[in-house]
Interface confidence: medium
């Protein structure tokens, strides 16, 4: 059973993940067209199910494409370089899901835009945080 200490740490990690994803979303929404229009042409895989920490495997597998899109955007709207931002997200995802159990991610049939993708994972973080508090 998770201790109150480990629950607090998980909550902190989820909050940081949420903050980083929100930062990317805010940065994207600050773009002037046609940059945003171009970014929306990139498709991301969405998880079929995302209700537990192990499902973060699906986010981890999409971090490389996310970094590539952010690099392409070359935005000054982030206080971090895309590489550093994605690195932070990567560390948190790995700490949250662990590496002891291997989980095969199942993806939905429909792909999504970067905005839909980020919103989905932001909602995931909010949902898990609400169960911890």
């Amino acid at each position: 059973a998770p201790t109150s200490s480990s629950t607090k740490k998980t909550q902190l990690q989820l909050e940081h993940l949420l903050l980083d994803l929100q930062m990317i979303l805010n940065g994207i929404n600050n773009y002037k067209n046609p940059k945003l229009t171009r970014m929306l042409t990139f498709k991301f895989y969405m998880p079929k199910k995302a209700t537990e920490l192990k499902h973060l495997q699906c986010l981890e597998e999409e971090l490389k494409p996310l970094e590539e899109v952010l690099n392409l955007a070359q935005s000054k709207n982030f206080h971090l370089r895309p590489r550093d931002l994605i690195s932070n997200i990567n560390v948190i995802v790995l700490e949250l899901k662990g590496s002891e159990t291997t989980f095969m991610c199942e993806y939905a049939d429909e792909t999504a835009t970067i905005v839909e993708f980020l919103n989905r994972w932001i909602t995931f973080c909010q949902s898990i945080i609400s169960t911890l508090t």
């Epitope: 902190l12 790995l94 590496s99």
Partner: antibody, heavy 117, light 107 residues
Amino acid sequence: QVQLVQSGAEVKKPGSSVKVSCKASGGTFTSYAINWVRQAPGQGLEWMGRIIPIIGRVDYAQKFQGRVTITADESTSTAYMELSSLRSEDTAVYYCARGFVGGFDVWGQGTLVTVSS
Amino acid sequence: DIQMTQSPSSLSASVGDRVTITCRASQDISNYLNWYQQKPGKAPKLLIYGASSLQSGVPSRFSGSGSGTDFTLTISSLQPEDFATYYCQQTYTIPLTFGQGTKVEIK
């Protein structure tokens, strides 16, 4: 309980390189960031960089970029920090430490690197 | 880079005293602030993470507070083993940075 065990003290000449190892035992190694922090005599703590072993992603502090190389060998649960072009100011205790958002919860015992001609 | 400034740089106190150390970040870091204790010749030890969460095994006389840019570490009743140097650290963004340290000495 995870422990990080570092290699022994080193004495190096200016201009040479040093490679410090950090071996994890008793727990998971791959799903955490392994950081390197140094402390010069009588000075504070300075973050040098980190590696996420499971994916080999590395981040460096700007100050050390180009002079430091952080690597990891998953098969032996060991992380390495190599610092090149050593100068006297690099004389310090070098620590490896595990973690990120929730702080560095496990530290190695430290490795003293002395740079002297 | 985010600068972390601790005050005071050193302080003298007696066993039983209430001790407060402050840490200020050069920009908003939410609650991504950790506190460490270091004794001479030893590796730092994590005391507080997330500004206010007590690390497992750390005595309850240690507490942390704050959010945004201003943070505080409090030792409610100083014990002989608490004489050490204390560091704050931000884990909000790369590069991760530490405060310069606060040395707590015996009066």
